[in-house]
């Protein structure tokens, strides 16, 4: 009821709490002398379900049978309507529609740690839509019983606040949960367990790792556990991995030797505990320990390549390049690279430590047989040296790979293909494919890239340090013993028409013809490999089509003669450049008038 109503009453039969689907009878009745003045039969009683009129009747009382009420609370309000006045509220009542509790399912209890308290969880089943009280009961040996009630509406957890002790680990305890509301009650099936069944150890703590003699092969993991722990699970993984290595150990007593860790690797370690081989549950995983394993001396050998450049009649420049060892080969922080250069006949040797670079350039005499050895060193030692005899890589013409081609292969990849050399192809021990950005000045500072290919391969996909719209000079070397042959080609992964034409910087007259000189197009405007230059000319003030001369592109060329101009005629000249994608816009225009006599 709303509370004591002065004007009348609303009663609900059989009860104001009903089972879903039940029917109720609602009666609204006026108290004496509370109706409309003058005529009691003018009393009009109206029954509202919340704000919706569901029934009315003239007189002192109204009966209404109501069905189909939804789960939850429905408010009924009775009002009185008299002639020439507003409706006035007489009284009201709520009807609560719900269901009896279902049997709680999957009751399970746990004690976290040997010093923890027993707590149980269960599944309530469907909502009752009514206040439902849960009572948890635990009975143990010697007729001991404990009981706890839950006042929360969505109760599915209770902590008894009692601690089971290991004095008699095999003693049986039985738990049961009972749900009660206004429409009924239901109890779970009993759950029977022992101390060993329900105690879940606390996760191990104070985890440490020690490496004897700073060696990864002599590693021990230490931790602390609760006193009764019998089993441990260890899991560990490199910090950048998602897969765990798992180890199960019995009676470890807080230590375990790990034998398969990789050097110079950050690992994550976690440990879990259990009290009994087949009873109870594993603890949560411990907090992670992160630790880096010690370095070991590098394994593997450096991939070394070189370039020779003629300086003068007696000297040559040698540039050595090498690739970083992989993390698994370096097995530590590489502190320096050791380069040894030796003249093989005279025995002279020089050694140098290189830090912070993976290249080294020196000048040596053109005479003699030279060899280099390069190794990588970390705090524990050095890798095996890679030895290379310095030779003329392109000297053996018969070893030159044939029909070299370079084609774009998707985004930022170039597929290089070739045919084996004419000389016995079985003599080839390996191919090396080398590429570097094409710079018209032949800049030796441009980074060099290379990859090695087996002797039976006739193609290689190059993708490292390949940028769109850049032209690369690509060489394929065939190596056989102390001989080498090479072929070269230009290639790009993506191209479009150059952004500008060459800039004519001079036109000079020579014996009745002219020599045109130009500046190279800046590399960033070439937009790929140039194939041709075109020189255009036409008579000034003429509307005729210009004549043109097409010159194959050569890296170093920046002048060209034209001998088809008429003397004493003023011409306008300009140039364009072409890639496979098309022709650039005009470069600058220059006027020129040939002074010489006509041929």
């Amino acid at each position: 009821k709303i509370d004591a109503c002065k004007r009348g009453d609303v009663t609900v039969k059989p009860s104001h709490v009903i089972l879903l689907g039940s029917t109720v009878n609602i009666t609204c009745s006026l108290k004496p002398r509370q109706g409309c003045f003058h005529y009691s039969r003018r009393n009009k009683l109206i029954l509202y379900k919340f704000d919706r009129r569901i029934n009315f009747h003239h007189g002192h009382s109204l009966n209404s049978q109501v069905t189909g009420l939804p789960l939850g609370t429905t408010l009924f309000v009775c009002k009185l309507a008299c002639i020439n006045s507003d409706e006035i509220q007489i009284c009201g009542a709520e009807i609560f529609v719900g269901v009896a509790p279902e049997q709680p399912q999957n009751l399970s209890c746990i004690q976290k740690g040997e010093q923890g308290t027993v707590a149980c969880t269960w599944e309530r089943g469907r909502d009752t839509h009514l206040y439902t009280e849960y009572t948890l009961q635990l009975s143990g040996p010697k007729n001991l019983t404990w009981q706890k009630q839950c006042k929360d509406i969505y109760c599915d957890y209770l902590d008894f606040g009692i601690n089971l002790t290991p004095e008699s680990p095999e003693s049986n305890f039985t738990a049961k949960v009972t749900a009660v509301n206004s429409l009924g009650s239901s109890s779970s099936l009993p759950s029977t367990f022992t101390f060993l069944d329900i105690v879940r150890p606390l996760p191990p703590w104070d985890i440490r790792i020690k490496f004897q003699k700073a060696s990864v092969s002599r590693c021990t993991l230490y931790w602390r556990d609760e006193g009764l722990v019998l089993l441990n699970r260890l899991r560990y993984r490199p910090s950048n991995s998602r897969l765990w290595n798992m180890v199960n150990v019995t009676k470890a007593k807080g230590r375990h030797d790990l034998l398969d860790l990789k050097p110079f690797t950050e690992y994550e370690f976690q440990i879990s505990s259990k009290l009994h081989l087949y009873k109870g549950s594993w603890s949560d995983w411990s907090e992670s320990l992160r630790a880096q394993t010690p370095e070991e001396e590098p394994t593997g050998m450096l991939d070394v390549w070189y370039m020779k450049r003629h300086i003068d009649y007696s000297r040559q420049q040698i540039s050595l390049f090498w690739k970083n060892l992989s993390v698994s080969e370096a097995r530590g922080k590489i502190l320096h690279y050791q380069v040894t250069l030796q003249e093989l006949t005279g025995g002279k040797a020089m050694t140098q430590n290189i830090t912070g670079h993976t290249s080294w350039t020196t000048v040596i005499p053109r005479t003699g047989n030279w060899a280099v050895a390069v190794s990588a060193a970390n705090s524990k030692g050095s890798s095996l040296p890679t030895r290379i005899n310095i030779m003329n890589l392109c000297e053996a013409g018969l070893l030159a790979p044939r029909q070299v081609s370079a084609n774009s292969e998707g985004m930022d990849n170039i597929l290089v293909t070739w045919q084996p050399p004419r000389k016995d192809p079985s003599a080839v021990q390996e191919y090396v494919v080398e590429w570097r950005e094409l710079h018209p000045g032949g800049d030796t500072q441009v980074p060099l890239n290379w990859l090695r290919s087996r002797p039976y391969n006739v193609s290689a996909l190059i993708s490292e340090n390949i940028k769109s719209y850049i032209c690369y000079e690509i060489r394929v070397y065939a190596l056989s013993g102390d001989q080498g042959g090479c072929s070269s080609i230009l290639g790009n992964s993506k191209h479009k028409a150059p952004l500008s034409g060459p800039h004519i910087n001079a036109i000079t007259e020579e014996k009745g013809s002219i020599l045109i000189s130009w500046n190279s197009i800046p590399v960033q405007e070439q937009m790929g490999c140039l194939l041709h230059y075109r020189i255009y000319w036409k008579e000034r003030d003429s509307n005729s089509q210009p004549q043109l001369c097409e010159i194959p592109y050569r890296v170093s060329q920046n002048s060209h003669p034209i001998n088809s101009l008429q003397p004493r005629v003023t011409y306008v000249l300009w140039m364009t450049a072409l890639t496979a994608a098309g022709e650039s816009s005009h470069g600058n225009e220059r006027e020129f008038c040939l002074q010489g006599k006509a041929n």
Epitope: H16, G72, T73, D127, L130, I153
Partner: nanobody, 115 residues
Framework: QVQLQESGGGLVQPGGSLRLSCTAS????????MDWYRQAPGNEREWVAS???????YYDGSAKGRFTISRDNAKMTVYLQMNSLEPEDTAVYFC?????????WGQGTQVTVSS
Amino acid sequence: QVQLQESGGGLVQPGGSLRLSCTASGSIVSIYNMDWYRQAPGNEREWVASITSSGDPYYDGSAKGRFTISRDNAKMTVYLQMNSLEPEDTAVYFCKVPTEKGNYWGQGTQVTVSS
């Protein structure tokens, strides 16, 4: 045990607005309706608006179109936004939570509409 505390009442001019709040202690309120009632001097307490546990609002005829009831189950609070107030709305406004074990009422907050 559920306790209810109303707030937000005051003096307002005709045509003005007020927002009443009622905060409950005890999480059981989330499965029940929350209601607003009012009692004018010399009159009986009358129902104004209800909101179900799932958020469906209902209004008495005098409140329909001017008042809006809402609830925030996380904060265990029900609100009544009252617009276009008239002198006839002057009353003490009470918050109520009906349960099958009995009704819980707040102490009320005074709303006075006067120029």
